[in-house]
Interface confidence: low
């Protein structure tokens, strides 16, 4: 009869953590008679995984009925795999003997790799908005991966960031690992459309890294600039005063007109125009009837943006000037809302 060979047809098996690994082993002959044992590792320090003849191995089941004399399939399944199970498994045929069976021939070994994918990275930014030129911190977390080796990169609009700190926990052996990274980002006025990306590369992802993103639109506040201008209107004794609110983000904005310190009208930004950089512009106007006033009028455009302290810009209407040229006083016609397209 042909010499017995112990065939482990799979050089390697890749199993996800928590699943069952099937390790295949067959013999080419029924003789010599004797049991099979499975070991992890080779040499004197090898670890017994399964003994056909004796012992209790609750995580191990055999593929075939090893009690049948004509069985030549010594494959096993190991349940609930963890990364600690990684290693090379040898199927070893023993020659029956007394008092001990004698090792006869070993299979070539099957390398079991246990891999768990990292979870999708979650990127979180600061709790409160910040203005340009400020530095804000973003965190990125991903969990449940194995092996421990992992690469994390940060990008802002495709440009790699360098100011970040990363930790992989735990430091020692574990079933799975987590990564936590904090990156510092300096905001600019152009960052409304910007994105911060955390990219995680791991052996389980086969060169296709996972990405988590955060939009800086959730983080940035660009305060508005104000400009108050006066324009004559065709009608006698009327002056149109406009307040240009430029380059602000987010849209949440309330504008109040004051005449000599007294509230004349309050309105909320609604129909805004969007700039290419994602910021907004808005304009409010006030139609002023100057004929009823002898004294100069101080008009103030006061803007409260995104819950921040109000900013304002004032404009003096000179009553002495000819109405058609400059306009003068302010029995302001507070008639309704801002109709932007009046001129």
């Amino acid at each position: 009869e042909e010499e017995l060979q112990v065939i482990q047809p799979d050089k390697s098996v890749l199993v996800a953590a928590g699943e069952t690994a099937t390790l295949r082993c067959t013999a080419t002959s029924l003789i010599p008679v004797g049991p099979i044992q499975w070991f992890r590792g080779a040499g004197p320090g090898r670890e017994l995984i399964y003994n056909q003849k004796e012992g209790h191995f609750p995580r191990v089941t055999t593929v075939s009925d090893l009690t049948k004399r004509n069985n030549m399939d010594f494959s096993i399944r190991i349940g609930n795999i963890t990364p600690a199970d990684a290693g090379t498994y040898y199927c070893v045929k023993f020659r029956k003997g007394s008092p001990d069976d004698v090792e006869f021939k070993s299979g070539a070994g099957t390398e079991l790799s246990v891999r768990a994918k990292p979870s999708a990275p979650v990127v979180s930014g600061p709790a409160a908005r910040a203005t340009p030129q400020h530095t804000v911190s973003f965190t990125c977390e991903s969990h449940g991966f194995s092996p421990r080796d992992i690469t994390l990169k940060w990008f802002k609009n495709g440009n790699e960031l360098s100011d970040f700190q990363t930790n992989v926990d735990p430091v020692g052996e574990s079933v799975s690992y987590s990564i936590h990274s904090t990156a510092k980002v300096v905001l600019t006025r152009e960052d409304v459309h910007s994105q911060v990306i955390c990219e995680v590369a791991h052996v389980t992802l086969q060169g296709d890294p996972l990405r988590g993103t955060a939009n800086l639109s959730e983080t940035i506040r660009v305060p508005p600039t104000l400009e108050v201008t006066q324009q004559p209107v065709r009608a006698e004794n009327q002056v149109n005063v406009t307040c240009q609110v430029r380059k602000f983000y987010p849209q949440r904005l309330q504008l109040t007109w004051l005449e000599n310190g007294n509230v004349s009208r309050t309105e909320t930004a609604s129909t805004v125009t969007e700039n290419k950089d994602g910021t907004y512009n808005w304009m409010s106007w006030l139609l002023v009837n100057v004929s009823a006033h002898r004294d100069d009028v101080k008009l103030t455009c006061q803007v409260e943006h995104d819950g921040q302290p109000a900013v304002s810009k004032s404009h003096d209407l000179k009553v002495s000037a000819h109405p058609k040229e400059q306009g003068s006083n302010t029995a302001a016609e507070n008639t309704g809302s801002n109709e932007r397209n009046i001129y």
Partner: antibody, heavy 120, light 107 residues
Framework: QVQLQQPGAERVKPGASVKMSCKAS????????ITWVKQRPGQGLEWIGD????????NHIEKFKSKATLTVDTSSNTAYMQLSRLTSEDSAVYYC?????????????WGQGTTLTVSS | DIQMTQSPASLSASVGETVTITCRAS??????LAWYQQKQGKSPQLLVY???TLAEGVPSRFSGSGSGTQFSLKINSLQPEDFGNYYC?????????FGSGTRLVIK
């Protein structure tokens, strides 16, 4: 090129046995698993088992363990499947299949199939 | 053993159409799924293995996708030679088991 040659037809009586062959050529016979598949008339494919010619190692689906015996003859690069205690339920086309992917459970090359008729 | 459930059992379509056949495994088989085509009176032919890899010589109008327990085979722009029976088969064995098949007929 890889080829698997099977006899076109076998006719046997109920209760008898049949040993059908699958002759391989065009590749290293002992390096790749050979799988056997059953297809009853108008029905789907049913995996019976496979054998590793390099070792004679076999796998069977449970329902065929007592029905089908898989063997190989490496000297003639031929795989055999013996079906025992035949009944009309065993009337079917039997395919052998192999290929470079056979270790990984897919089969690139198929024989033409042997039509087995069990009839008295 | 892992059971494979294929749907639909039968499908009629016209030349030029796009069709999708699905296959469900009774347990996680990762990406270890193959697809075969079989024409009347002929042997099966491998189309796709490991869920999405096209076998040699298979036209690019065929594409496989899926992982875990849910898989599909998509055929774009059906050609007359595409009509026949299609089978999925899990590779996560042995034993390996086939789906019950999908018959693709000309409308």
């Amino acid at each position: 090129q890889v080829q698997l040659q099977q006899p076109g037809a076998e006719r046997v009586k109920p209760g008898a046995s049949v040993k059908m062959s699958c002759k391989a050529s065009g590749y290293t016979f002992t390096s790749y698993w050979i799988t056997w598949v059953k297809q009853r008339p108008g029905q789907g494919l049913e995996w019976i088992g496979d054998i590793y010619p390099g070792s004679g190692s076999t796998n069977h689906i449970e329902k065929f363990k007592s029905k089908a015996t898989l063997t190989v003859d490496t000297s003639s690069n031929t795989a055999y499947m013996q079906l025992s205690r035949l009944t009309s339920e065993d009337s079917a086309v039997y395919y052998c299949a192999t290929g470079y992917g056979s270790s990984y459970g897919y089969f690139d090359y198929w024989g033409q199939g042997t039509t087995l008729t069990v009839s008295s | 053993d892992i059971q494979m459930t294929q749907s639909p059992a039968s499908l009629s379509a016209s030349v030029g159409e796009t069709v999708t056949i699905t296959c469900r495994a009774s347990e996680n088989i990762y990406s270890y799924l193959a697809w075969y085509q079989q024409k009347q009176g002929k042997s099966p032919q491998l189309l796709v293995y490991t869920a999405k890899t096209l076998a040699e010589g298979v036209p690019s109008r065929f594409s496989g996708s899926g992982s875990g327990t849910q898989f599909s085979l998509k055929i774009n722009s059906l050609q007359p030679e595409d009509f026949g029976n299609y089978y999925c088969q899990h590779q996560y064995g042995p034993p390996f088991t086939f789906g019950s098949g999908t018959r693709l007929v000309i409308k």
